[in-house]
């Protein structure tokens, strides 16, 4: 029977007695830089190549037993899970190996730099189809090896990384903390995080996505047909590389940020058991199981978007925090969230060119993150129009005034310490689809596109009072692209995205003493692309 | 990587020679930086990763890690250069003693330099 | 339910041999480096030997050392120890654990230990 | 003679408080190695109390915390209780034995 974790990932239409997807990432190469390999193993023999490329550190002390097929191990057992003839996922996929970690399994990130280096090189010397790049690695935080990752990333290189087996944030290893790279975070048979002894997988806002990593059937280097089970992280990103073999086999233009939406768009969301992540941790933790898509082709026609998380600020009076988007990607919206309420809104700004989302802390706050919503908007034409505080009692407002141009999303942004202490007015937005609306005290931002085709709406969900937190989600075949608080006093948390639902945080009533005229409304634009849409019919 | 001292000492002897001079001082207010593994048991103090400013050639490369081996002996310390990177990012890995990353920071066109570090399976 | 089995202990002569064995389950066997500590009776916990999840690293207390030999076998999801030359005081509760294989990035802790099994080296 | 050092024996009525010391050296736990520590109940297996220097695996009461600080540990127990009577070891890893190293125990005993 199909083991369980090719089945978690195989959409229910091909969900046969076996896992034969359409395609099996015929035209792509993936280079994995891990330990040798036993590339004569029957799961991946032909499939295979073994590069002459070798850096690694002497193995420790006197204690170690060189014996290839021991040394062998975490390589093999990956190659067979990336394109493996019977436990792969992307079995049609060529490979490619570097030894850049030792029989240990360890390596150093000196290394790992080389190899990359290696891999350009070769691209260049010998430019192929699409190619992925799996770092089933990590150390720590590494400010050279992300660097490297960046570039090759830009240099069209798909980037697959482990997130580490450390039961942490991702953020403080290397290359799982690199924004260019897809980082994968372990999940098991239940969709829980996979533990792995008093351990288990990394998670926080440097993941991308989960996939399985417990228990995973792939290649043993004991003998040339063994099978064994691993877990870790280097098994999770193993299947995400597997996918997205598949993907740009199907695909072949498809960009990095093209993918990386697809894979997100494609996941299994909301099922992975959150209580699991330190409770920090778990608003900022991507709760996706990565799966292959249902059908190879037609989902062009979709507006995609991705939710991305800053760094925290730090508690510091005028801290901020900067979420950017990646280069073809647009910013859409920007929120902000703070723990303990004390923030004082935030702002898309340019920087560089490109517009970033900036939230600001308050004084007293323990610090703040900036949310962006980043999309894929072919030929948009995107600017942000301010209106500064009203100060007049019907609250701030801002519209978008360019033929053309719709309203993707509100952002609001404010000097006074505690909106809390100025009563806003009760605001009543509805029925205007492109103005932003807020406290008279605060400056208000809208963010205007134009773009081909491209239709919003406002939504919205009000409830009378604070009660932890209000929601209101975009119906199919709409795309979430802002996320909004109103009226934005004190009480309120913040706002984010999660998937296709505008989540709005706040202090409970009960803890706060609030009047029910303090009500709070989730405010969703939602958006779809009519050009997309006909682009994909007449591809079809 | 085999680090034997008879290599260290030929590549030493070699630079002695070598023009010792900062004459392309750094530019003005960029202060190179160091970094360096916050996991204690996972540095690699000895081996550093010496990054350039990006628009840095190979050339450059070479002779800035020309320059450091020059200077360093001129104060009695052996230094290897491991690697010249090119094609992804620009700069050089050398193997030296931490005493002579003050040195190493003001070279020209260096933009950071981080200590070698350990990664390992996941 | 994650579990762990000890076998074959028993009485022994000084300078006889005993294979002990650990079956494992429940778990990903093969992702967990696997470990012998033996306790003296009335003594404290003393390591005895470790091995990697793919037995490419192992290690054994000097006191062992030369006469005793862990291994495992991952497709059978079990863990050895044989034991030669043996001492009167390697009598002790030999207990096998696991720790997850971190690849020397980390030594976890012993979360997992069976019942243990007697081994008494007496004439 | 262990490689980490104990106290043989510490006690205290129910309600005290009491902590365990773990003392090592430079190439254990003053190495950056973790350490973790066990409480075995009498013709028992030992039982991970604490790992990773601080960490409570589920189902491990809070009155047990974990602490280290340079090249040693300690385990402090808050709120004694009559059940906590057992064997206490604390475990790290040793760079220089490569392998792992043992406390040599420390009895706790519930007075009254």
């Known amino acids: 029977s199909i083991p369980w974790n090719l089945e978690r990932i195989t959409p229910p239409r091909y969900r046969a007695d076996e896992y034969q997807p359409p395609d099996g990432g015929s035209l792509v190469e993936v280079y994995l830089l891990d330990t040798s390999i036993q590339s004569d193993h029957r799961e991946i023999e032909g499939r295979v190549m073994v590069t002459d490329f070798e850096n690694v550190p002497e193995e420790d002390g006197t204690r170690f037993h060189r014996q290839a097929s021991k040394c062998d191990s975490h390589g093999t057992h990956l190659a067979g899970v990336v394109s493996g003839r019977d436990a792969g996922v992307a079995k049609g996929a060529s490979m490619r190996s570097l030894r850049v970690l030792n029989c240990q399994g360890k390596g150093t990130v000196s290394g790992t730099l080389i190899g990359l280096e290696f891999i350009r090189k070769s691209q260049l010397v010998q430019p192929v189809g699409p190619l992925v790049v799996l770092l089933p690695l990590a150390g720590g935080y590494s400010r050279v090896l992300n660097a490297a990752c960046q570039r090759l990333a830009r240099a069209g290189v798909v980037l697959v990384t482990a997130a580490g087996n450390f039961r942490d944030d991702a953020c403080l290893y290397s290359p799982a903390s690199a924004p260019e790279v897809i980082t994968v975070g372990a999940t098991n048979a239940q969709d829980q995080p996979v533990t792995l002894g008093t351990l288990g997988t990394n998670f926080g806002r440097c993941v991308d996505l989960f996939a399985p990593g417990e228990d995973i059937i792939g290649a043993s280097s004991d003998c040339s047909t063994c099978f064994v089970s691993q877990s870790g992280t280097s098994q999770a990103a193993a299947h995400v590389a597997g996918i997205a073999a598949m993907m740009l086999s199907a695909e072949p233009e498809l960009t990095l940020a093209e993918l990386r939406q697809r894979l997100i768009h494609f996941s299994a969301k909301d099922v992975i058991n959150e209580a699991w992540f330190p409770e920090d941790q778990r608003v900022l933790t991507p709760n996706l199981v990565a799966a292959l898509p249902p059908s190879t082709h037609g989902a062009g026609w979709q507006l995609f978007c991705r939710t991305v998380w800053s760094a925290h600020s730090g508690p510091t009076r005028m801290a901020t925090a900067i979420a950017r988007c990646a280069p073809d990607e647009e910013l859409l919206s920007c929120s902000s969230f703070s723990r303990s309420g004390k923030r004082r809104g935030e702002r898309m700004e340019a920087q560089g060119g490109k517009l970033v989302c900036r939230a600001h802390n308050a004084f007293g706050g323990e610090g703040v993150y900036a949310i962006a919503r980043c999309c894929l908007l072919p030929q948009a034409n995107c600017s942000v129009h301010t209106a500064p505080p009203a100060e007049a009692s019907m609250g701030t407002r801002v519209h978008c005034h360019q033929q053309g141009h719709v309203l993707t999303g509100c952002s609001s942004h404010w000097e006074v310490e505690d909106l809390g202490t100025h009563k806003p007015p009760v605001l009543r937005p509805r029925g205007q689809p492109n103005q932003c609306v807020g406290h008279r005290e605060a400056s208000i931002h809208a963010s205007c596109c134009h773009a081909p085709g491209l239709e919003c709406k406002v939504k919205e969900h009000g409830i009378p009072a604070p009660q932890g937190q209000v929601t209101v989600a975009c119906e199919e075949g709409w795309t979430l692209t802002g996320c909004s608080a109103l009226p934005g006093t004190s009480h309120v948390l913040g706002a984010y995205a999660v998937d296709n639902t505008c989540v709005v945080r706040s202090r409970d009533v009960s803890t706060t003493g609030s009047t029910s005229e303090e009500a709070v409304t989730a405010v969703a634009i939602c958006c779809r692309s009519r050009h997309l849409a006909q682009a994909s019919q007449e591809l079809q | 990587q085999e680090d034997e001292d008879g290599d260290y000492e030929e590549l030493v002897l070699a630079l002695r020679s070598e023009e010792d001079g900062l004459a392309e001082a750094p530019e003005h207010g960029t202060t190179a930086t160091f970094h360096r593994c916050a996991k204690d048991p996972w540095r690699l103090p000895g081996t550093y990763v010496v990054v350039l400013k990006e628009e840095t050639h190979l050339s450059q490369s070479e002779r800035t890690a020309r320059r450091l081996q020059a200077q360093a002996a001129r104060r009695g310390y052996l230094t290897k250069i491991l690697h010249v990177f090119h094609g992804l990012l620009p700069g050089f890995l050398v193997k030296m003693s931490g005493d002579l990353l003050e040195l190493a920071l003001k070279l020209p066109h260096v933009d950071y330099i981080e200590e070698d570090s350990s990664v390992f399976a996941q | 339910e994650v579990q762990l089995v000890e076998s074959g202990g028993g009485l022994v002569k000084p300078g006889g041999s005993l294979r002990l064995s650990c079956a494992a389950s429940?778990?990903?066997?093969?992702?967990?480096?696997m470990n012998w500590v033996r306790q003296a009776p009335g003594k404290g916990l003393e390591w005895v030997s470790s091995i990697s999840s793919s037995s490419h690293y192992i290690s054994h207390a000097d006191s062992v050392k030369g006469r005793f030999t862990i291994s495992r076998d991952n497709a059978k999801n079990s863990l050895y120890l044989q034991m030669n030359s043996l001492r009167a005081e390697d009598t002790a509760v030999y207990f096998c654990?696991?720790?997850?294989?971190?690849?020397?990035?980390?030594?976890?802790?012993?979360?997992?230990w069976g019942q243990g099994t007697m081994v008494t080296v007496s004439s | 003679e262990s490689v980490l050092t104990q106290p043989p024996s510490v006690s205290g009525a129910p309600g005290q408080r009491v902590t365990i010391s773990c003392t090592g050296s430079s190439s254990n736990i003053g190495a950056g190695y973790d350490v973790h520590w066990y409480q075995q109940l009498p013709g028992t297996a030992p039982k991970l109390l604490i790992s990773?220097?601080?960490n409570r695996p589920s189902g491990v009461p809070d009155r047990f915390s974990g602490s280290k600080s340079g090249t040693s540990a300690s385990l402090a127990i808050t709120g004694l209780q009559a059940e906590d009577e057992a064997d206490y070891y604390c475990?790290?890893?040793?760079?220089?034995?490569?392998?792992?190293?043992f406390g040599g125990g420390t009895k706790l005993t519930v007075l009254g």
């Open positions: 475990q790290s890893y040793d760079s220089s034995l490569s392998g792992s190293v």
């Open positions: 990773g220097n601080s």
């Open positions: 429940g778990f990903t066997f093969s992702s967990y480096s």
């Open positions: 654990a696991r720790d997850y294989d971190f690849h020397s990035a980390y030594y976890d802790a012993f979360d997992v």
